[in-house]
């Protein structure tokens, strides 16, 4: 079943054909180098999608820059294929499923003076289910409220305050959000969760609620990159991959992240009896992509050199801000109860064939579901530990 997930996985820029750039992992490295001790969490599929959507309205070099930045070297003929691919993906991802909450979307907020091209609005709606909203940016507080309220509503209150401040000179703001909460295929037993140490650095220890479950997991030790990788399946098709670098080897693992590495991990997984200890946490990432994407060669669209003639007849419009926010919660909830036997707290001597894997220092995580839904680094597990029942 994991093999099936591997074969279906498009780990480049989503439905990417030949890829010269490893967009997902290059973006990760840019974010990681900008904030080495911070949590990182973003959705490659979601960002790729919003950039592809933006390319619908971009002309000439601006379009080329976006597509090449994504790692797509498309001939005109396959551009439609790209958008259709995203359209299909978006429909699949937004399908309501048991024990699986995913809200993913894009919206364009444009100043009242900007007349949008009907063809662009129509393509956005049809292909990307994206909304466009006329917005009075002169009233920056009102505009910010309009945008934040929209995203809060779309994510059922899971993403609030997407924008913290807003420039009143803004003309076009693109927002891109994704919230994910799913149930594990097999739950962790609540009674097995207890506070444990998490070593943010060798000197800094914080206490976290540490979940535990002994089970058969897909597992591998990558000796080249000095890390251990475990796959924990969600209900449905998604799987979380947790990567624990050996002490002091985080940067080595980060440098080695690539589409090839991920494929290798997924192919080399072997079932293994593990005592898995994993922090219970929520993590979010919020990024001003207009500040980040120029490092990946996508810059025109955010400058006065932008050619967005497909969006509007106004010759001088550019994207003022492109905001991405991703949120995930990791807790014990599963669709199937964890084995009710006493395996969580029994003596180790009784389980000599079982290996203990404790995520008690910074680790990486992927959530994959045919695509890389999320990629993140947990440097300090989030502390929103409300034992809510909306699981």
């Amino acid at each position: 079943e994991m093999k099936k997930r591997v074969e279906d996985l498009h780990v480049g820029a989503t439905v990417a054909p030949s890829s010269r750039r490893d967009f997902t992992f290059d973006l990760y490295r840019v974010l990681a180098s900008a904030a080495p001790s911070q949590n990182i969490f973003f959705s490659p599929v979601s960002i790729s999608m919003s950039l592809a959507m933006l390319s619908l309205g971009a002309g000439s070099s601006t379009k080329m820059q976006i597509l090449e930045g994504l790692g797509l070297n498309l001939q005109k003929s396959s551009e439609e294929e790209l958008h259709r691919g995203f359209q299909q993906l978006l429909q699949e991802l937004n399908q309501p499923r048991d024990g699986f909450q995913l809200s993913l979307g894009n919206a364009l907020f444009t100043d009242l003076v900007v007349d949008l091209q009907d063809t662009f609005v129509s393509a956005m709606k049809t292909l990307y289910l994206a909304d466009t909203f006329p917005t009075n940016f002169r009233d920056s507080a009102g505009a910010m409220k309009q945008i934040n309220d929209y995203v809060a509503k779309q994510t059922k209150g899971k993403i609030v305050d997407l924008l913290k401040n807003l420039d009143s000179n803004a003309v076009v703001i693109m927002v891109n959000y994704i919230f994910f909460k799913a149930k594990w295929e097999t739950s962790f037993n609540h009674k097995g969760t207890q506070e444990q140490d998490f070593y943010v650095t060798s000197e800094t220890v914080v206490r976290v609620p540490m979940m535990s479950r002994e089970d058969q997991y897909h597992y591998l030790l990558d000796r080249n990159l000095s890390c251990r990788v475990v796959g924990v399946p969600y209900q449905g098709n998604a799987t979380a991959l947790f990567i624990l670098p050996s002490e002091g080897k985080m940067q080595q693992v980060e440098n080695g992240l690539s589409e090839k590495t991920l494929r290798k991990w997924l192919k080399m997984f072997k079932k293994r009896q593990l005592e898995l200890y994993l922090p219970k946490f929520s993590i979010e990432g919020s990024y001003q992509l207009e500040k980040v994407l120029p490092s990946l060669g996508i810059s025109n669209v955010f400058t006065s050199h932008a050619d967005l003639s497909g969006i509007s007849n106004h010759s001088n419009i550019q994207v003022s801000e492109m905001v991405h926010k991703a949120v995930v919660e990791v807790d014990e909830s599963g669709t199937r109860a964890a084995a009710a036997t006493g395996t969580i707290f029994t003596f180790r001597s009784a389980r000599l064939n079982s290996q203990r894997l404790v995520f008690n220092r910074p680790f990486l995580m992927f959530i994959v579901d045919n695509n890389i839904l999320f990629l993140g680094k947990v440097n300090r597990p989030g502390s929103d530990y409300k034992d809510d029942d909306d699981k």
Partner: antibody, heavy 119, light 106 residues
Amino acid sequence: EVQLQQSGAELVKPGASVKLSCTASGFDIRDTFMHWVKQRPEQGLEWIGRIDLVNVNTKYDPNFQDRATITADTSSNTAYLQLTSLTSEDTAVYYCARGGYDVREFAYWGQGTLVTVSA
Amino acid sequence: QIVLTQSPAIMSASPGEKVTITCSATSSLIYMHWFQQKPGTSPKLWIYSTSNLASGVPARFSGSGSGTSYSLTISRMEAEDAATYYCQQRSSYPFTFGSGTKLEIK
């Protein structure tokens, strides 16, 4: 069966030191954390500190940091608490308690060791 | 460090009576834990991770709470419940205990 057997009562003079032991049976201490807790006569419980034998480090309450040292000898499956510069305030029962990843923290306690500091 | 304030310090209850002991913390906690101790014996883990009963603890005991406010409740007091109860936090170092509630039977 899990058991924590603590050393016998001690009568010590002010300013002296004492080293208490806690010998575990039924499990390997290399796999656990061992906590030490102080209880003065008719008083409440005070956490002194713990040794984490999995990640190999110690943590102390700042009130005990300067005078308490927790160590372990894995060959004899024993944890130790050394207290220095004793005063009458240190007259108390000292308990060891077990923690770890695969057991409930503080689910197992030793029977306690009474330390009396008196001239 | 996190200070735990337990109340009441001492109380007595008649058999069958409902008893509630509270424990408030100076900072928000992940979980609260409770111990029972009888004279001359080691403390026993009684309730762990806020609401889970330790092995052998009668079902008349329950624990609840979140953030900074927690409680231990006995639905119907029995003679064997007479003891001192301590709350404990392990959400940050140093671990701390409440000062204890001595529960007596009337």
